[in-house]
Interface confidence: medium
């Protein structure tokens, strides 16, 4: 990384948690001095090129499509910029996860799913037949990897004190430390509703 330049960004245009055979679009921030942008996957500390874009004067941020997602395409991605023959800059890294490689865990709650702000709820993710050593809890619609992780089995995720932003549909995934980008099928979904008017009648549609 050169001098005091800010690190260019890399981002997924949709969720980085991708079902087997699904697709995702990756965007590399354009930097003025680069004549070539390459998307690289980092496997075992080795870089492998996934795609490249030559710079055009009218170009916006270069985009790359990863389709037919599978175990080999899951992992850490980085944009590599060629500044000159022997000069490079690199973006931050992006982690892509593939789901559907193991059977699904089961997600349950320790109380009703309609809450008032400030209340607590615990979600439990368990798998009776598959000995996962890690679980992740994901909220539908989020564009980053789930922040909630647990190494317990079953995994308890404490949400709270909750605010209105906690409302949403949650699923959990199981995975193994040795293969952190290969996740299970999603669990059953639980919809949490946080409302400051508990008298409303909440019904959820599938």
């Amino acid at each position: 990384q050169e001098g005091d330049f800010p690190m260019p960004f890399i981002s997924a245009k949709s969720s980085p948690v991708i079902p087997l055979d699904g697709s995702v679009k990756i965007q590399c921030q354009a930097i003025r001095e680069a004549y070539l942008t390459q998307l690289m996957i980092i496997k075992n500390s080795t870089y492998r090129e996934i795609g490249r874009r030559l710079k055009f004067w009218n170009e916006t941020d270069p985009e790359f499509v990863i389709d037919h997602m599978d175990a080999n395409k899951a992992g850490r991605y980085q944009c590599q910029y060629r500044i000159g023959h022997y000069r490079f800059r690199y973006s931050d890294t992006l982690e892509l996860v593939v789901t559907g490689l193991y059977g699904k865990p089961f997600l349950s709650a320790d109380r009703g799913l309609v809450l008032m702000p400030g209340e607590n709820i615990s979600l439990t993710c368990s798998s009776a037949h598959i000995p996962f050593d890690r679980f992740s809890l994901a909220k539908e619609g989020e564009l980053s990897l789930p922040q909630h992780q647990s190494g317990e089995h079953p995994a308890n995720f404490s949400l709270g004190p909750v605010d209105l932003n906690v409302s949403g549909i949650y699923r959990c995934y199981g995975w193994y430390n040795r293969s952190p980008y290969l996740w299970s099928f999603p669990s059953n979904a639980l919809e949490l509703v946080v409302t400051d008017s508990i008298h409303q009648d909440y019904t959820t549609q599938n």
Partner: antibody
Framework: QVQLKESGPGLVAPSQSLSITCTVS????????VHWVRQPPGKGLEWLGI???????SYNSALMSRLSISKDNSKSQVFLKMNSLQTDDTAMYYC??????????WGQGTLVTVSA | DILMTQSPSSMSVSLGDTVSITCHAS??????IGWLQQKPGKSFKGLIY???NLEDGVPSRFSGSGSGADYSLTISSLESEDFADYYC?????????FGGGTKLEIK
């Protein structure tokens, strides 16, 4: 095109063990799990177990003590081993590729007869 | 284990008919059900997963419906190639369990 093909011994003596190989093509075992299912003559289907793409296994608890499933990703082969066979283990044994937690593609099956 | 009760066990129907096969699970399986077809002398083929979704290449005359513990497979305008055995299978829990099968025969 996705294909699975089972190969087994045909005849097994009672109390002996069974080994069946499922050789797959058209997909990678690092991306898809493989189930084993059997069907005794004139009877229904029974799920035996699965080896997931990541390598872990899930078994039918009724058979777990004598069942083992493994694989060799590089050879595109999945292996079923069952110990202490009895006559009621006589069945057609199938392997099937997992898809969305279910069975999408099946092999033709291999008939295993347990008899002295 | 979840018990899958499939009916009827056999039925005689004519070309062009519409038929429905039902499966009842011993508990709510939340659409975690699939349907399989086995043609005479052939292996099995997946038709439907997650209750209603057609596997690739399956004709649209096949459809699945249901919720909770009760599900059905409907075949409209039966064609000669549809005469086969059909099975439901649940994957809400381990072990996976199958219905007893339905044999479709030509009347």
């Amino acid at each position: 095109q996705v294909q699975l093909k089972e190969s087994g011994p045909g005849l097994v003596a009672p109390s002996q063990s069974l080994s069946i190989t499922c050789t797959v093509s058209g997909f990678s075992l690092t991306s898809y799990g493989v189930h084993w299912v059997r069907q005794p003559p004139g009877k229904g289907l029974e799920w035996l177990g699965i080896i997931w793409a990541g390598g872990s296994t899930s078994y039918n608890s009724a058979l777990m003590s004598r069942l083992s499933i493994s694989k060799d990703n590089s050879k595109s082969q999945v292996f079923l081993k069952m110990n202490s066979l009895q006559t009621d283990d006589t069945a057609m044994y199938y392997c099937a590729r997992d898809h969305y937690d279910l069975f999408a593609y099946w092999g033709q099956g291999t008939l295993v007869t347990v008899s002295a | 284990d979840i018990l899958m009760t499939q009916s009827p066990s056999s039925m005689s129907v004519s070309l062009g008919d519409t038929v429905s096969i039902t499966c009842h699970a011993s508990q709510d399986i939340s659409r975690n059900i699939g349907w399989l077809q086995q043609k005479p002398g052939k292996s099995f083929k997946g038709l439907i997963y997650h209750g209603t979704n057609l596997e690739d290449g399956v004709p649209s005359r096949f459809s699945g419906s249901g919720s909770g513990a009760d599900y059905s497979l409907t075949i409209s305008s039966l064609e000669s190639e549809d005469f086969a055995d059909y099975y439901c299978v649940q994957y809400a829990q381990f072990p996976r369990t199958f219905g007893g099968g339905t044999k479709l025969e030509i009347k």
